[in-house]
Interface confidence: medium
């Protein structure tokens, strides 16, 4: 899922398989002057960042799971 | 919708009514050593930050709308 870089988007391509347990936070960025695309940037527990495909049902599931996360997790 | 920038929970209270068009980005933070709660922090286009209730169906709708956002918006 390659993303056009000409508008200074931060996501050059997106990662397919990512496990929710490895995610520390997910930032959903609306389109703006820097980029005409919606961008989803996950920060992993090891400090790395990865771009996710906003159109992916898996990404929507991951975010939904995070929102409904049991506090004891 | 107070936000505290510490290595603890950042959200002291959550804001109820917020319009997606005012949101620049939404950060969903999983529970971790800094905070036992899932936190949802919206950065507004005016630079302000607002904490949203992760359990709110409205918040889930807002994020879903952002993920499915038409690029021309």
């Amino acid at each position: 899922a390659s993303v056009v870089t000409e508008l200074r988007c931060q996501c050059l391509q997106t990662l397919q398989g990512i496990h929710p347990k490895n995610i520390q936070s997910v930032n959903v960025k609306a389109p703006g002057p820097h980029c005409a695309e919606t961008e989803v940037i996950a920060t992993l527990k090891n400090g790395q960042k990865a771009c996710l495909n906003p159109a992916s049902p898996m990404v929507q599931k991951i975010i939904k799971k995070m929102l409904n996360c049991d506090k004891s997790n | 919708a107070s936000v505290v920038t510490e290595l603890r929970c950042q959200c002291l209270q959550t804001l109820q009514g917020i319009h997606p068009k005012n949101i620049q980005s939404v950060n969903v933070k999983a529970p971790g050593p800094h905070c036992a709660e899932t936190e949802v922090i919206a950065t507004l286009k005016n630079g302000q930050k607002a904490c949203l209730n992760p359990a709110s169906p409205m918040v889930q709708k807002i994020i879903k709308k952002m993920l499915n956002c038409d690029k021309s918006n």
């Epitope: 870089t5 200074r8 931060q10 990865a50 | 980005s25």
Partner: antibody, heavy 125, light 107 residues
Framework: EVQLLESGGGLVQPGGSLRLSCAAS????????MSWVRQAPGKGLEWVSA????????YYADSVKGRFTISRDNSKNTLYLQMNSLRAEDTAVYYC??????????????????WGQGTPVTVSS | DIQMTQSPSSLSASVGDRVTITCRAS??????LHWYQQKPGKAPKLLIY???NLESGVPSRFSGSGSGTDFTLTINSLQPEDFATYYC?????????FGQGTKLEIK
């Protein structure tokens, strides 16, 4: 070793032209955006222009728009800044900078992580 | 254009001190902000990227924080080599803009 080397600076009269070059080595030049940044004597940093990796998109500060042209030759690993209609206020040290900052293959943060040593441009009669 | 305002513009401190430099954006820039250090006669050097991430090889006494409009660069236990000028820079949108700089001098 990753390196940027500017050349082409010098003394020019107001209204004149100069072409700055920046030779890159040690990285895949065509993959990364590049910028020119200048610094007038005793002043702060001012971004001048940027160009995408392919050269397909260019960006300019308002102060140089219509007078300066950024370009690149990826086959020669070289970045250029063509400066026309030069003014006294264009006097500065000009730096080229790589807009690196790719974390893994999946995230790009456009940081100017490698800079040249700078080339001085003096516009004076 | 997004304006970046740094404060203070100059600062005197001693070796071992903890210093804080702030940078404010005229509109929200998410975490799209970098910090650079420049010594006289030298090119700038990247210290912090994306507001809070330490560039490789930069000592851990440097740290950054903030997002949205307000950002901070902190230097813990100042060393002699830290006396320099510091700049913030936003990359949220072009034109890219730098703060006016903060000159850190020895007291």
């Amino acid at each position: 070793e990753v390196q940027l080397l500017e050349s082409g600076g010098g003394l020019v009269q107001p209204g004149g032209s100069l072409r700055l070059s920046c030779a890159a080595s040690g990285f895949t030049f065509s993959e990364l955006s590049m910028s020119w940044v200048r610094q007038a004597p005793g002043k702060g940093l001012e971004w001048v222009s940027a160009i995408s990796g392919s050269g397909g998109s260019t960006y300019y500060a308002d102060s140089v728009k219509g007078r300066f042209t950024i370009s690149r030759d990826n086959s020669k690993n070289t970045l250029y800044l063509q400066m026309n209609s030069l003014r006294a206020e264009d006097t500065a040290v000009y730096y080229c900078a790589r807009e690196g900052g790719r974390l893994e293959p999946y995230y790009y943060y456009y940081a100017m992580d490698v800079w040249g040593q700078g080339t001085p441009v003096t516009v004076s009669s | 254009d997004i304006q970046m305002t740094q404060s203070p513009s100059s600062l005197s401190a001693s070796v071992g001190d903890r210093v804080t430099i702030t940078c404010r954006a005229s509109q929200s820039i998410s975490d799209n902000l970098h910090w650079y250090q420049q010594k006289p006669g030298k090119a700038p050097k990247l210290l912090i990227y994306d507001a809070s991430n330490l560039e490789s090889g930069v000592p851990s006494r440097f740290s950054g924080s903030g997002s949205g409009t307000d950002f901070t660069l902190t230097i813990n236990s100042l060393q002699p080599e830290d006396f320099a000028t510091y700049y913030c820079q936003q990359y949220y949108s072009t034109p890219l803009t730098f703060g006016q700089g903060t000159k850190l001098e020895i007291k």
